[in-house]
Amino acid sequence: GSTAIGMKETAAAKFERQHMDSPDLGTGGGSGIEGRGSMGYRGSEDLPQLGDLAVSEVGWDGLRLNWTAADNAYEHFVIQVQEVNKVEAAQNLTLPGSLRAVDIPGLEAATPYRVSIYGVIRGYRTPVLSAEASTASGLNDIFEAQKIEWHEGTHHHHHH
């Protein structure tokens, strides 16, 4: 069996507590890409494949995922987040098929994570997309992030 990430509250539990009862299920769009996903081709498939996966920092203990996918095709998305050096410590999230972005809180600071995602269409899994990214290293990173956010806000433009 696999064990949960060793922290006060698992990422999946924290995510669910924060988002699962709210209508705007983590739909924020992110910038500042830290990791890019390549298509994890798994043989010939007759299902549409996910497009691109981007992972960026959110604060010191979170990651933001953005992905592209055909509209109205997906029943669910399933996401796995695991520390790169801890194969057994994985968290899974199952999300509605309408989402194209999600924030994942409750991770360890300054830690590399591998993020994987697939979609479910007509009851079958699509190929897996994966990317690697690290959470921020602490207060300096948060301060920088806030500075950039303020700067972007006052000049009304965003970097993508």
Epitope: A13, M20, R42, G43, A90, N92, S116
Partner: antibody, heavy 118, light 108 residues
Amino acid sequence: QVQLVQSGAEVKKPGSSVKVSCKASGGTFSSYAISWVRQAPGQGLEWMGGIIPIFGTANYAQKFQGRVTITADKSTSTAYMELSSLRSEDTAVYYCAKGNFYGGLDYWGQGTTVTVSS
Amino acid sequence: DIQMTQSPSTLSASVGDRVTITCRASQSISSWLAWYQQKPGKAPKLLIYDASSLESGVPSRFSGSGSGTEFTLTISSLQPDDFATYYCQQNKKFPSGTFGQGTKVEIK
């Protein structure tokens, strides 16, 4: 560490229904998939269907479509499998199991024996 | 539903033998395949997922390979504890899917 505890053995009459429960502890119940698998005496494993508790949506194997209903109660972290129109061939051990990211069933309940006999 | 066919249905082997079990899918399932070990009166135990990924705590003598429609489970050097029944399962279906009919590994 995830643990799945199932309800006790059942003896049922042909034509009746049975409802087996599976209580989960550890991990985040709503976010993972629960499958139901059965095994008749001396036979192999049969996947019956599964559910994602967070959405309540279930998928079923064709063989059991229309006769099985899988549900989940997030408030009690419990999944249920109800099989109707029981016949003697439904005598089996019924297991619940948790699926990992790739669909492999990594944690299993202890099994519930259902005997269908007149 | 996708059909899974395992061979052989019974395999007689000795301790130390290299054992290979084959599983064939009725259509391509990419690498969405798991292998299980089951002993009498016990729940199955996950050995391999994603066709070739070893489940945590499973001895490295177990390995899986294949993609598409043809898959194999190999036990590099059979141990006394390995005499059991082995099942493959396709996981292209969500959240899980059909099993093969099983392969019983018995003492020669």
